[in-house]
């Protein structure tokens, strides 16, 4: 059991420790996973290669605020979202929307988080005199992973349960904050 993945009202993905964040729905490609129509076999495509290192995936920069209950981070954090499709590095455009995007005839590789970084953020709560502190785990890089017939849709989903929204009530006035932490710009500590 790991720390949960929260999704706030703006559907921003808030990954926490021990979780693998999921790309936002608009970035998902539902043709990237093995399905029955492929008989569980990786399809042939013109750029067949055995070396995963020859494949690249798109790392989309994603800026968002971290939320926790009624609180929100004082500053936005920037992380990567791993695009759902992988392809030969030489065919990937440098920017989204430029060039022709290579699309294999079936599922073969999946772009997934590779490395994470933890970042301490100051949380501001409505009416609060001082912020709280929380650490979030952010995607630092992505990698292509070859899928086998044993991979299924659930394998790359979040491991945590989606948290219920906290009950609406009076806003917190958190005062629990280290004076030392207040003096530091902790958002950039990592």
């Amino acid at each position: 059991q790991g720390w949960q993945a929260f999704k706030n009202d703006a559907t921003e993905i808030i990954p926490e420790l021990g979780e693998y964040p999921e790309p936002p729905p608009e970035l998902e490609n539902n043709k990237t996973m093995n399905r029955a129509e492929n008989g569980g076999r990786p399809p042939h495509h013109p750029f067949e290669t055995k070396d995963v290192s020859e494949y690249s995936c798109r790392e989309l920069h994603f800026t968002r605020y971290v939320t926790d209950g009624p609180c929100r981070s004082a500053k936005p954090v920037t992380e990567l979202v791993c695009s759902g499709q992988c392809g030969p590095a030489r065919l990937l455009p440098n920017a989204i929307g430029r060039g022709k995007w290579w699309r294999p005839s079936g599922p073969d590789f999946r772009c997934i988080p590779d490395r994470y970084r933890a970042q301490r953020v100051q949380l501001l709560c409505p009416g609060g005199e001082a912020p709280r502190a929380r650490k979030v785990r952010l995607v630092a890089s992505c990698k292509c992973k070859r899928l086998t017939r044993f991979h299924n849709q659930s394998e790359l989903k979040d491991f945590g349960t989606e948290a219920a929204r906290p009950q609406k009530g009076r806003k917190p006035r958190p005062r629990a904050r280290s004076a030392k932490a207040n003096q530091a710009e902790l958002e950039n500590a990592y």
Partner: antibody, heavy 118, light 107 residues
Framework: QVQLVQSGAEVKKPGASVKVSCKVS????????QHWVRQAPGKGLEWMGW????????EYASKFQGRVTMTEDTSTDTAYMELSSLRSEDTAVYYC???????????WGQGTTVTVSS | DIQMTQSPSSLSASVGDRVTITCRAS??????LAWYQQKPGKAPKLLIY???TLWSGVPSRFSGSGSGTDFTLTISSLQPEDFATYYC?????????FGGGTKVEIK
């Protein structure tokens, strides 16, 4: 699988110090906040303080200020809590806890019994 | 320090019963409240935080409500593994403080 494994029971004399360790596995300790909570025999829970292993930031309950020191070794993912000038009322089970925030305790160690007796 | 008062201090119930435990803070803590379950000889386990948000892996029969100074933990249908002591904890103001606990025993 997140796990916190604490050091074994200790028996100390009044005035002595005790240092309890807490080995964290499942994620790097620097990615967390470490808390220490104690529970006297048959009593409730008492928060002692938290620390941020990444930057060495600490916040102690005023009751323990000057007597408690919380440190971490990020290379071994181990947290330590040292309590000095022990007295009989410090006899308790000491728990380490960890989490992603400074204000709740997500995962707990099994506890370390510290007995202070002359 | 904020005082957290739980009631009752103990209660007897049967499997299948609906159980309600209350926690009162000595001052407004908004929704900065967590609930923990502790079994004899074991460490506490987080059940609920932000007064009403269920922690990962906790059965849905547990629920929390309240804000300000009055909070409730409800177990909709008590199971054999739920017999334990329950603590509330405020996370609004340092030092964080716990309630005295409510022991749920088998009737």
């Amino acid at each position: 699988q997140v796990q916190l494994v604490q050091s074994g029971a200790e028996v100390k004399k009044p005035g002595a110090s005790v240092k309890v360790s807490c080995k964290v596995s499942g994620f790097p300790i620097k990615d967390t906040f470490q808390h220490w909570v104690r529970q006297a025999p048959g009593k409730g829970l008492e928060w002692m303080g938290w620390s941020d292993p990444e930057i060495g930031d600490t916040e102690y309950a005023s009751k323990f200020q000057g007597r408690v020191t919380m440190t971490e070794d990020t290379s071994t993912d181990t947290a330590y809590m040292e309590l000095s000038s022990l007295r009989s009322e410090d006899t308790a089970v000491y728990y380490c806890a960890t989490g992603d925030t400074t204000y709740k305790f997500d995962f707990w160690g099994q506890g370390t019994t510290v007995t202070v007796s002359s | 320090d904020i005082q957290m008062t739980q009631s009752p201090s103990s209660l007897s119930a049967s499997v299948g019963d609906r159980v309600t435990i209350t926690c009162r803070a000595s001052q407004d803590i908004s929704t900065a409240l967590a609930w923990y379950q502790q079994k004899p000889g074991k460490a506490p386990k987080l059940l609920i935080y932000w007064a009403s948000t269920l922690w990962s892996g906790v059965p849905s029969r547990f629920s929390g409500s309240g804000s300000g100074t009055d909070f409730t933990l409800t177990i909709s249908s008590l199971q054999p593994e739920d017999f334990a002591t329950y603590y509330c904890q405020q996370g609004d103001t340092l030092p964080y403080t716990f309630g005295g606990g409510t022991k749920v025993e088998i009737k």
